[in-house]
């Protein structure tokens, strides 16, 4: 369960892939599209508001113990819009919604490297936001060896 309804912190950052392609958001036909693209040298990067939430993780052992805490994030590139996991379509979409946000908008934050993060679907453990054909998609990671695969690694930058 997520501890409290307010985030423990918020962080405004640009999001890029492991290979330094930018994640951009464009309004098209009254809905937002998400792109993975190379930006021109001085082109401004889109920013995303990451809201960090604490989530208690139930103990694997018997009883009601709590084994540890996880960090969940929501990602909002513009007011009232959040990234959502569409597990049926294996897609990542931007949806307009009100708080409290649905579980599909929450992602468990992983650090696979000191300067890279990954986003695991709260609603579908083992499924991560990744890059496929210059778009964001949901990618199933079936073993810990594949957790470091480049297409699920992202960089956060304040600039």
């Amino acid at each position: 369960s997520i501890t409290g309804i307010s985030p423990i912190t918020e962080y405004l950052a640009s999001l890029s892939t492991y290979n330094d392609q930018s994640i951009t958001f464009a309004l098209e036909d009254e809905s937002y599209e998400i792109y993975v693209e190379d930006l021109k040298k001085d082109e401004k990067k889109d920013k995303v508001l990451l809201s960090y939430y604490e989530s208690q993780h139930p103990s694997n052992e018997s009883g009601d113990g709590v084994d540890g805490k996880m960090l969940m994030v929501t990602l909002s590139p513009t007011k009232d819009f959040w990234l959502h996991a569409n597990n049926k379509e294996h897609s990542v979409e931007l949806h307009k919604c009100e708080k409290p946000l649905p579980d599909q908008a929450f992602f468990v934050l992983h650090n696979m490297h000191s300067n890279c993060v990954s986003f695991e679907c709260k609603t579908d453990p083992g499924v991560f936001i990744g890059v496929k054909d210059n778009h964001l998609a949901l990618i199933k990671v079936d073993s810990s060896e594949n957790l470091c695969t480049e297409n699920i690694l992202f960089k956060l930058s304040e600039t």
Epitope: T9, H110, N115, S144
Partner: antibody, heavy 122, light 107 residues
Framework: EVQLVESGGGLVQPGGSLRLSCAAS????????MTWIRQAPGKGLEWIAS????????YYPDSVKGRFTISRDDAKSSLYLQMNSLRAEDTAVYYC???????????????WGQGTLVTVSS | DIQMTQSPSSLSASVGDRVTITCLAS??????LAWYQQKPGKSPKLLIY???RLQDGVPSRFSGSGSGTDFTLTISSLQPEDFATYFC?????????FGGGTKVEIK
Amino acid sequence: EVQLVESGGGLVQPGGSLRLSCAASGFTFNNYWMTWIRQAPGKGLEWIASITYTGGGTYYPDSVKGRFTISRDDAKSSLYLQMNSLRAEDTAVYYCTRANYYYNTYGGFPYWGQGTLVTVSS
Amino acid sequence: DIQMTQSPSSLSASVGDRVTITCLASEGFSNDLAWYQQKPGKSPKLLIYAASRLQDGVPSRFSGSGSGTDFTLTISSLQPEDFATYFCQQGSKYPLTFGGGTKVEIK
């Protein structure tokens, strides 16, 4: 209850080697980044090495890079620090620490071992 | 590397005093800033993380604030058990770095 117990410290000559161990219990070891931090006598804290929860990434400051190696054995819930080419300035209490959250580095170090003293002297 | 400059390096205070310790970073970063308390011969104890979040079990007289480059630890009413050394630590960028410490002594 989370417990971290270091061992392996002692007196070693300059240029020598030592292997520190940290036995972890009370939590799911393989879900956490683990870190070694040291403190020279009467001095401040210095980060020495970190390892990702998967074991796939290791990180060091320049002061120990190439001399120290952090590793983990998830089956034994143990963390290690192999220290080679030891110098007098490596003399310190070495602490094993655990990250605050599953899977990532955010939020400081809520759990520390009692520390093990490494003395490098001839 | 991000340098963390802590001030003052030491201070004398009385029980009941309000105490403020500051940590200045050489460059701005997200708020992955922690504060620790250490007593002689003991391991450090996490007090505050995420710049302002109180670690479980830590008395509410401790509080943290700040963002960017300036961070503050405040003890609202100093208690006898609070006489110790305090360290800040940034976790945003590797190498992880600590402040030099602030020793809080009895006046």
